[in-house]
Interface confidence: low
């Protein structure tokens, strides 16, 4: 079975990843608008998130506004919301499973069941990591695509916000943590072999005598 240190490391990384997904979800910095044209309306910086956008004045003053309605949102943003929320829930399930299957907890007595639970937790974290990487990478792809598209007016071009980097980090942590937990091989059960061996040995001994 994997060492206790490896298990703790896996859980710690996955929990950090889970927290980072929540941060990524909450921060209104998925996209930052680069207003760099003379024909645009406003010279403010706009931060767009999954739930709200914030207008940052040149003075540093910031005003945030929650999006009006779900239907008004672009489909990619709706999909990103859904995937990130599901990822947070899935990762929470992973945290729960990793606590239950942890070596240093007594929720399960059977070491084999513990190890299997930990592998399931690892797989769950891997799924959560993939669920984060998809919307983050898709959003980044769209931003890059628009930025280098000469048909897109300069006033409409966006840059990648901090949330995307947090999202990638979160995904990396979840995948790494989940991967470490998946290395948790169930213990090989040697009892039938040892019983058989001892019985054979005792029989051999009696025959010898």
């Amino acid at each position: 079975m994997a060492s206790m240190g490896l298990q703790v490391m896996g859980i710690a990384l996955a929990v950090l990843g889970w927290l980072a997904v929540m941060l990524c979800c909450a921060l209104p910095m998925w996209r930052v608008t680069a207003f760099i044209g003379s024909n645009i309306v406003t010279s403010q910086t706009i931060w767009e998130g999954l739930w709200m956008n914030c207008v940052v004045q040149s003075t540093g003053q910031m005003q945030c506004k929650v999006y009006d309605s779900l239907l008004a949102l672009p489909q990619d943003l709706q999909a990103a919301r859904a995937l990130v929320i599901i990822s947070i829930i899935v990762a929470a399930l992973g945290v729960l499973l990793s606590v239950v299957g942890g070596k240093c907890t007594n929720c399960l007595e059977d070491e084999s069941a513990k190890a299997k639970t930990m592998i399931v937790a690892g797989v769950v974290f891997l799924l959560a990591g993939l669920m984060v990487i998809v919307p983050v990478s898709w959003t980044a792809h769209n931003i890059i695509q628009d930025f280098y598209n000469p048909l897109v007016a300069s006033g409409q071009k966006r840059e990648m916000g901090a949330s995307l980097y947090v999202g990638w980090a979160a995904s990396g942590l979840l995948l790494l943590g989940g991967g470490l937990l998946c290395c948790n091989c169930p213990p090989r059960t040697d009892k039938p072999y040892s019983a058989k061996y001892s019985a054979a040995r005792s029989a051999a001994a009696s025959n010898y005598v």
Epitope: Q44, N53, Q156
Partner: antibody, heavy 122, light 111 residues
Framework: QVQLQQPGAELVRPGASVKLSCKAS????????MNWVKQRPGQGLEWIAM????????RLNQKFKDKATLTVDRSSSTAYMQLSSPTSEDSAVYYC???????????????WGQGTTLTVSS | DIVLTQSPASLAVSLGQRATISCRAS??????????MHWFQQKPGQPPKLLIK???NVESGVPARFSGSGSGTDFTLNIHPVEEEDISTYYC?????????FGGGTKLEIK
């Protein structure tokens, strides 16, 4: 509720400048861009310019740069557009229209005044 | 400046039928997230009224028979079923860049 009040009609002689007004109520005047749109009889709509009452920042359709001058009076929540040296070509209905922003920067016209019919005639 | 070409210039539709109005922009007015195209209805002697913003978002208070679609350079306003009160002129308008421009208008009549 949001209201943009404009005089129904204005008569001006050719060459004599005219100042059209638009009184806003029902919202924070200094938080929204105010626009002016022209519509000649039986014709389409033409965006002239807009002004942000908070700092009087203006965005102008270059076609009207020598024709329209936009100002605001914050104390009375009124926007003005002055048309210089009007000719018969300037005879039209002039609307003031507020723009709101979807998420802070995606702009669209949401409220319109009833329009002022400007007649340029001697 | 972006030129918006509306077609047809006038349209006669029977009550209860579908009316389809097209608007073509001289260049794209969409990013991967948003289409900067809006639709207005104007009745004689009245100011324009916002029907649809950002290509497909129906303004609150606007009947569900109005719908908008499209992206890039081609946009469509659909009215189904057409009712008597829909007799108006319809305009598309972009907010992609300044100057903002309007289409030439489509006059909807009842057969």
């Amino acid at each position: 509720q949001v209201q943009l009040q404009q005089p129904g009609a204005e008569l001006v002689r050719p060459g004599a400048s005219v100042k059209l007004s638009c009184k806003a109520s029902g919202y924070t005047f200094t938080s929204y861009w105010m626009n002016w749109v022209k519509q000649r009889p039986g014709q389409g709509l033409e965006w002239i310019a807009m002004i942000h009452p908070s700092d009087s920042e203006i965005r102008l359709n270059q076609k009207f740069k020598d024709k329209a001058t936009l100002t605001v009076d914050r104390s009375s929540s009124t926007a003005y557009m002055q048309l210089s040296s009007p000719t018969s070509e300037d005879s039209a209905v002039y609307y003031c229209a507020r723009i709101d922003s979807y998420y802070g920067y995606l702009f669209y016209f949401d409220y319109w005044g009833q329009g002022t019919t400007l007649t340029v005639s001697s | 400046d972006i030129v918006l070409t509306q077609s047809p210039a006038s349209l006669a539709v029977s009550l209860g039928q579908r009316a389809t109005i097209s608007c073509r922009a001289s260049q794209t007015v969409s990013t991967s997230s948003y289409s900067y195209m809006h639709w207005f209805q104007q009745k004689p002697g009245q100011p324009p009224k916002l029907l649809i913003k950002f290509a497909s978002n129906v303004e609150s208070g606007v009947p569900a028979r109005f719908s908008g679609s499209g992206s890039g350079t081609d946009f469509t306003l659909n009215i189904h079923p057409v009712e008597e009160e829909d007799i108006s002129t319809y305009y598309c308008q972009h907010s992609w860049e300044i100057p903002w421009t309007f289409g030439g208008g489509t006059k909807l009549e009842i057969k």
